[in-house]
């Protein structure tokens, strides 16, 4: 899977959207690596 910073950002946005935004406060692109997915 793509692990560039931009891919991580878009994947996280999708995850936040699907979860209704209910995730930990520090779950942001600069805090998570691609392995977080």
């Amino acid at each position: 899977a793509c692990d560039t910073a931009t891919c991580v950002t878009h994947r996280l946005a999708g995850l936040l959207s699907r979860s209704g935004g209910v995730v930990k406060n520090n779950f942001v692109p600069t805090n998570v690596g691609s392995k977080a997915f």
Epitope: C2, T4, T9
Partner: antibody, heavy 119, light 107 residues
Framework: EVQLQQSGPELVKPGASVKISCKAS????????MNWVKQSHGKSLEWIGD????????HYNQKFKGKATLTVDKSSSTAYMELRSLTSEDSAVYYC????????????WGQGTTLTVSS | DIVMTQSQKFMSTSVGDRVSVTCKAS??????VAWYRQKPGQSPKALIY???YRYSGVPDRFTGSGSGTDFTLTISNVQSEDLADYIC?????????FGGGTKLEIK
């Protein structure tokens, strides 16, 4: 409102260095990567690199290694790009850009900084 | 580095028409392509990410499609304000790379 405000135009001599700034507002600066992009006159775009404002980590385009240095100042929510050993080939418009998710999911770009290298 | 080729440097269209701008990647980049519009004298503005998803505020006249190596940006019901350069970008691999742009001219 998310904004990326870049520093003003620069006219510098060959061989000199310059530091361009990009001040972020309207979102949490440390949450999102900051990208830097070069646009030479009449040409398309070249990605220089990105910086993680949370920890200062960087990815560089090999072409710009040794030419560009990307840093951040978290206290002022400002990203910087220093360009060194300038030549006429470095004359261009330089943009900062960041994809945010909160408060809005969008890919924001600064207004651009024009760099002219001339003796 | 991945080369993004926009073979048509210029395209001419009329208000109300539909036009398709194409972009070809030198290797498989999955769906990880963005499209930007750059009006003369302005910064690029993001339109599409992940090949086919519009950013908020982008009119639904703009549609992206494709995956792998072949990508298309379609503009339906072209407006006079669509006079601009349209540029693709891949972000599947570092370094990110951009196409050379397609300049849309309005007849």
């Amino acid at each position: 409102e998310v904004q990326l405000q870049q520093s003003g135009p620069e006219l510098v001599k060959p061989g000199a260095s310059v530091k361009i700034s990009c001040k972020a507002s309207g979102y949490t600066f440390t949450d999102y990567y900051m990208n830097w992009v070069k646009q030479s006159h009449g040409k398309s775009l070249e990605w220089i690199g990105d910086v993680n404002p949370n920890n200062g980590g960087t990815h560089y385009n090999q072409k710009f290694k040794g030419k560009a240095t990307l840093t951040v100042d978290k206290s002022s929510s400002t990203a910087y790009m220093e360009l060194r050993s300038l030549t006429s080939e470095d004359s261009a418009v330089y943009y900062c850009a960041s994809i945010t998710i909160v408060p809005v999911y969008f890919d924001f770009w600064g207004q651009g900084t024009t760099l002219t290298v001339s003796s | 580095d991945i080369v993004m080729t926009q073979s048509q440097k210029f395209m001419s269209t009329s208000v109300g028409d539909r036009v398709s701008v194409t972009c070809k990647a030198s290797q498989n980049v999955g769906p990880n392509v963005a499209w930007y519009r750059q009006k003369p004298g302005q910064s690029p503005k993001a339109l599409i990410y992940s090949a086919s998803y519009r950013y908020s505020g982008v009119p639904d006249r703009f549609t992206g499609s494709g995956s792998g190596t072949d990508f298309t940006l379609t503009i339906s019901n072209v407006q006079s304000e669509d006079l601009a350069d349209y540029i693709c970008q891949q972000y599947n691999y570092y370094p990110y790379t951009f196409g050379g742009g397609t300049k849309l001219e309005i007849k």
